[in-house]
Amino acid sequence: RDKVMSEFNNNFRQQMENYPKNNHTASILDRMQADFKCCGAANYTDWEKIPSMSKNRVPDSCCINVTVGCGINFNEKAIHKEGCVEKIGGWLRKNVLEQKLISEEDLGGEQKLISEEDLHHHHHH
């Protein structure tokens, strides 16, 4: 489990680096952040470390009320501050790892550590 979570953490951070450059990656991270009400890997401040992202910006999917541009010049009270790795990781342990192996699909050359099916399942519960 720890190995899986460590890989998921590394993968999530790697995909954050790709966020501004890859629309497919961006849409998957946006889906995760919106569905799990989280922002960044450890927390929302991870986004300010992404070189090609403006330091006063997080993805709109971090917003509590998602609207176009809501992540620009954000206020902490308007975004989800908790990190996604811990939040999704807890959900994975509870709902997925106990039941089955995590699906591994290609995501920009990286292993995808959470399947669309799992996300869909979370979204409807």
Epitope: N43, T45, E48, S54, K55, N56, R57, G69, C70, I72, N73, F74, N75, E76, K77, A78
Partner: antibody
């Protein structure tokens, strides 16, 4: 009503230090980013530093980086600016400014406190 | 960094005149543009936020327009209390937060 009251300004020699304070009242302090903005005599407005609601994010202008430190005490509804290695070109009125963020602009400003750096 | 350039840097006008001040950003800032008024010895006061929204308590003779890189502040009919210095400021990309150099509005 919203009030921002700065204090701590004064005359200091080059290389010296000062600590500015800003007492906030009339609003929920933790709902806002806070800024220090300065204005040298007869000059325009210059952003100095900002700090996020919780204090997790802090940035300074390049002109003060490594010399000025912004902080806040949310329990005391107070904002601070520790200014070290002061130079003559730091002479200015320093304003404590409330920032709702997004596209709303700086909606409340303190009256300012004058810092004079001179030998 | 995004540079903000105001024009003119000073302007003389009479009571009742219509006055327009312009502000240009070095790159697109969408509508993340604010206008402030400052009178001598006083703190600045927010007039317009989000390029065109009037701040509460500001007279309706003030209006803002534009988006992207070019913005305007218009005073439809100058009043004696409007003679002051006006600044634009962008909040789209920071740090740093940047202001225009100011436009001084004087009585003709």
């Amino acid at each position: 009503q919203v009030q921002l009251v700065e204090s701590g300004g004064g005359l200091v020699k080059p290389g010296g230090s000062l600590r500015l304070s800003c007492a906030a009242s009339g609003f929920t302090f933790t709902d806002y980013f806070m800024n220090w903005i300065r204005q040298a005599p007869g000059k325009g407005l210059e952003w100095v530093s900002y700090i996020s609601n919780s204090g997790a994010i802090k940035y300074q202008a390049d002109s003060v980086k490594g010399r000025f430190t912004i902080s806040r005490d949310n329990a005391k509804n107070s904002l601070y600016l520790q200014m070290n290695s002061l130079r003559a070109d730091d002479t200015a009125v320093y304003y404590c400014v409330r920032d709702p963020r997004s596209y709303y602009g700086f909606d409340y400003w303190g009256q300012g406190t004058l810092v004079t750096v001179s030998s | 960094d995004i540079q903000m350039t105001q024009s003119p840097s000073s302007l003389s006008a009479s009571v009742g005149d219509r006055v327009t001040i312009t502000c240009r950003a070095s790159q697109s800032i969408r509508n993340f543009l604010n206008w402030y008024q400052q009178k001598p010895g006083k703190a600045p006061r927010l007039l317009i936020y989000a390029a065109s929204s009037l701040q509460s308590g500001v007279p309706s003779r003030f209006s803002g327009g534009g988006s992207g890189t070019d913005f305007t502040l218009t005073i439809s009919s100058l009043q004696p209390e409007d003679f002051a210095t006006y600044y634009c400021q962008q909040s789209y990309s920071n740090p740093p937060i940047t202001f225009g150099q100011g436009t001084r509005l004087e009585i003709k």
